[in-house]
């Protein structure tokens, strides 16, 4: 003879692959305190239980170690714990209480477990800013992972110099010492759930702060093609009266502040241009000499100079012989 009871609440539960879910089950209050028996969770239509507290009963190979009966008759608890959920667990389940000594047992209503694709992704957290040459700890976390599940496997991928730090069930720490060339490169944290054979990843682009490493000046002279100088230049011949456009550019992140000075500036000198562009509409004697582009950055500054040498037009020189 079978007595029946209802699993309370909605008739379906959803769990994502690789994660955990608790199928709530509460025994009837009418269950006598003297009732001594074993609890069994069954897959609908199956004879072998998926979980039980009966030491003499085999459980299904597929669910062994992942499905657990949380048995506490005093608290009327007969819940089913499922960890490392797999797509194949997608089914209806019911609970049965059986006794070898009593004439009757108890059977619950069915509850459907729906296993969905894993949509959660790892989180990557960076404390503050990444600075070139300075070590920083990045954390890849999966806070939605349950403690009782098979611990996930974390893997990191990055071109930057790294070393692995501590890890927990839900997180892994990576120490990174980025270089200027690592700015805008990808860093990936990959998390594999071995219990379910599912892998998820998150990729971020590194934002590395670094002082300017290179400063260059592009020179636009009249209609002629531009040319670039990458180091201090002692002398650049320019024809008197010619229009000259000097364009300074530098790397660095965040971008360096570019300014132009005439001569070799002191630290607090006043710039003649507060941008990377210096326009000289008509080169004359006042422009002969040194021009310096300074790339200023919180992490360090860099400058480059060039010396203009003015060629005078034969008829343009006053007091000529």
């Amino acid at each position: 003879q079978e007595r029946r009871f209802q699993l309370e609440g909605p008739e379906s539960l959803t769990v994502q692959e690789g994660l955990c879910v608790l199928v709530p089950c509460r025994l009837p209050t009418t269950l006598p305190a003297s009732y001594y028996g074993y609890g069994y969770w069954f897959l609908e239509g199956a004879d072998v239980p998926v979980a039980t507290n009966d030491p003499d009963e085999e459980v299904q190979e597929e669910t062994r170690g992942r499905f657990h009966l949380l048995w506490d008759p005093r608290r009327k608890n007969c819940s089913l714990s499922i960890r490392d959920a797999r797509r194949r667990d997608n089914a209806a389940y019911f609970f049965r209480l059986k006794s070898k000594w009593m004439k009757y047992g108890y059977t619950s209503s069915k509850l459907s477990v729906r296993v969905m694709a894993l949509t959660h992704r790892p989180n990557i957290s960076i404390p503050g800013t990444l600075e070139s040459g300075h070590p920083s700890n990045l954390t890849c976390s999966v806070p939605w992972v349950c403690e009782q599940g098979t611990p996930p496997i974390f893997s990191w991928m990055s071109a930057a110099p790294t070393s692995l730090g501590p890890r927990t069930t839900q997180s892994s720490v990576l120490t990174i010492t980025p270089r200027p060339q690592d700015h805008s490169t990808n860093l990936t944290c990959q998390v594999t759930f071995p219990g379910a054979g599912v892998t998820m990843e998150r990729t971020i682009q590194l934002n590395v702060s670094y002082a300017p490493q290179k400063v260059a000046i592009s020179i636009f002279q009249g209609n002629s093609a531009a040319f670039k100088i990458l180091q201090n230049t002692s002398s650049l011949p320019v024809l008197e009266g010619q229009a000259l456009r000097l364009l300074c550019d530098a790397d660095g992140n965040p971008p360096a502040h570019l300014s132009w000075f005439q001569g070799f500036p002191a630290l607090n000198a006043t710039p003649i241009s507060n941008t990377g562009v210096l326009e000289l509409p008509q080169v004359g004697s006042a422009e002969e000499g040194d021009f310096t582009c300074r790339a200023q950055h919180p992490l360090g500054s860099l400058q480059i100079s060039l010396s203009l040498f003015v060629h005078w037009k034969p008829e343009g020189r006053a007091g000529g012989v």
């Epitope: 029946r4 309370e8 609440g9 909605p10 008739e11 379906s12 209050t29 009418t30 209806a92 069915k110």
Partner: antibody, heavy 116, light 106 residues
């Protein structure tokens, strides 16, 4: 004898309050989760709220959330529905019901009319 | 929320005639239940767990379906079957009912 009997219905003005009761007999009340279901005149069934056997979990329909409160007293075998801020659209026959797979019990209902 | 759409809304059948009504969900449900309600009375569970007949339900009733599509069939209409039939799901909150199919006797 009917296992579930509702009471407490009546005529109430919009914005008013009413408390419905559902008295259970002939079965172990504390073994069952119970629902309130309503039916507006000449309309279909609409689920209102649910409470588990030991009041550990409660669910409400969005239409009544924040206005209605379901509760139970297992010692007195009674289910309650406290209704506040009543609206004309709450006018209906209110049933308490056990919708278990093997034990399906509905009360005879109590009528709530919200009108000015 | 899961919305259940029943069709037809109303139908009439002669005694002995086969009657089929459907209930479609806008999202997959695990089990569908059906209730019968006669005018002026409380509803009664008629079918549970998609296809199982509740106690006292005549064998001429059958039901089936899966996912988002379910149906209830009366193999041979009888006068006492004239009623409104509601489908119901609780695969996810909130519990919802269909708007009902009213079956009249021709």
């Amino acid at each position: 004898e009917v296992p579930l009997v509702e009471s407490g219905g009546g005529l109430v003005k919009p914005g008013g309050s009413l408390k419905l009761s559902c008295a259970a007999s002939g079965f172990t009340f504390s073994d069952y989760g119970i629902h309130w279901v309503r039916q507006a005149p000449e309309k279909g069934l609409e689920w209102v709220a649910y409470i588990t056997s030991v009041s550990s979990t409660i669910y409400y329909a969005d239409t009544v959330k924040g206005r209605f409160t379901i509760s139970r007293d297992n010692a007195k075998n009674t289910l309650f529905l406290q209704m506040t801020s009543l609206r004309s659209e709450d006018t209906a026959m209110y049933y308490c019901a056990i919708l278990d797979w093997y034990f399906d019990v509905w009360g005879t209902g109590t009528t709530v009319t919200v009108s000015s | 929320q899961i919305v259940l759409t029943q069709s037809p809304a109303i139908m009439s059948a002669s005694p002995g005639e086969k009657v089929t009504m459907t209930c479609s969900a806008n999202s997959s449900v695990s089990f569908m239940h059906w209730f019968q309600q006669k005018s002026g009375t409380s509803p009664k569970r008629w079918i549970y767990d998609t296809s199982k007949l509740a106690s006292g339900v005549p064998a001429r009733f059958s039901a089936s379906g899966s996912g988002t599509s379910y149906s209830l069939t009366i193999s041979s209409m009888e006068a006492e079957d004239a009623a409104t039939y509601y489908c119901q799901q609780w695969s996810s909150n909130p519990l919802t009912f269909g708007a009902g199919t009213k079956v009249e006797l021709k």
